[in-house]
Amino acid sequence: QLPPGKPEIFKCRSPNKETFTCWWRPGTDGGLPTNYSLTYHREGETLMHECPDYITGGPNSCHFGKQYTSMWRTYVMMVNATNQMGSSFSDELYVDVTYIVQPDPPLELTVEVKQPEDRKPYLWMKWSPPTLIDLKTGWFTLLYEIRLKPEKAAEWETHFAGQQTEFKILSLHPGQKYLVQVRCKPDHGYWSAWSPATFIQIPSDFIMNDHHHHHH
């Protein structure tokens, strides 16, 4: 029987910069029941606080609700693991909420086949940013990525759309049914999950284009 091994806080995420959650990995348990506590202070403070919510984020987590989350202050936190034989501490972790945002997927993905008379046909798609993200403040830049594939294909084809919320793709296989998804990330944050798949049937008379794709 031994003191617990060193835990590691390995992940922190915020869906919208208004709340966030951090998760830790326990070290070895030393063969005894182990209690974990997360303590933190914010930049400019000396007073240490204990995690306000160990429940919401699931096992080995700490959730900071709205009243505990500040975008203006860096959080300095560590996890203490304790059993009957002793304690061990994680390394200190510094968290700036700006840099841990992982948004919800984009919304309202619509996909259409456009067949203008004077030009080659193309696949046109548009979407909306996730509702929890406030883009009006200006500091939040969302980047988008699209992926699509024929229904029975194994490999996805991905396209980076930058900050745009619409996109054209010119090169598709006629007669195929395609799955299309979109995801987003803040410039220094994390990719969202992919949006639910939208299906689109490419007409059999769709003419392949040499130019692969272009932004709208």
Epitope: C12, W72, Y94, V95, D96, I100, H188
Partner: antibody
């Protein structure tokens, strides 16, 4: 203990490429961005770019765009910086550095001297 | 790119005496999220740089309290209240508000 251990010194010819490695240990490699910073002899520090090892998303200093490629290998917890079309002005010590969930550099590698000479 | 200008270029200080380094940026370092990402690093002779101060005035873990940072907007200062022999090296200010991140030219601190 967090460690960033870089590959050894290199001597390269003008026009060639160099690839410097940075092996991370003591933490979960995919959790934090890795940055590359260089320092020419007797000069200051210059930020080259950064990578998020979780998905290999990169941002580069436009000054190096097209010449620098930053990659990460999750299986070996190693980041790489490749600089191509080398010229004598690229002679420098190249550092990798790690952030937290922040945008400043908390841990630094020991540096790799790259000498470009004909 | 944001240009960071440090003064003085070098500083020779008697142990126990204070020292002050100034850093000026060519544009405001207030991020649109309200934070100011101005940091100070020390590069001791023959070593890699090490973080001293983050976000203007916050000492990094293990940094002695004789180091303090202040300033806002475009003008920032690093102060050492009582210089010790181990403080010798080159001090750099750095901004990470705007990409590309940039560094000042450095201030060399020597002991008299």
């Amino acid at each position: 203990e967090v460690q960033l251990v870089q590959s050894g010194a290199e001597v390269k010819k003008p026009g060639s490429s160099v690839k410097v490695s940075c092996k991370a240990s003591g933490y979960t490699f995919t959790s934090y961005w890795i940055h590359w910073v260089r320092q020419a002899p007797g000069q200051g520090l210059e930020w080259m770019g950064e990578i998020d090892p979780s998905d290999s998303y990169t941002n580069y200093n436009q000054k190096f765009k097209g010449r620098v490629t930053i990659t990460a290998d999750k299986s070996t917890s190693t980041a790489y910086m490749e600089l191509s079309s080398l010229r004598s002005e690229d002679t420098a010590v190249y550092y990798c550095a790690r952030s937290f969930f922040t945008n400043w550099f908390a841990y630094w590698g020991q540096g790799t001297l790259v000498t470009v000479s004909s | 790119d944001v240009v960071m200008t440090q003064t003085p270029l070098s500083l020779s200080v008697t142990p126990g005496q204070p020292a002050s380094i100034s850093c000026r940026s060519s544009q405001s370092l207030v991020h649109s999220n309200g934070n100011t990402y101005l940091h100070w690093y020390l590069q001791k002779p023959g070593q890699s740089p090490q973080l001293l101060i983050y976000k203007v005035s916050n000492r990094f873990s293990g940094v002695p309290d004789r180091f303090s940072g202040s300033g806002s907007g475009t003008d920032f200062t690093l102060k050492i209240s009582r210089v010790e022999a181990e403080d010798v090296g080159v001090y750099y200010c750095s901004q990470s508000t705007h990409v590309p991140f940039t560094f000042g030219g450095g201030t060399k601190v020597e002991i008299k």
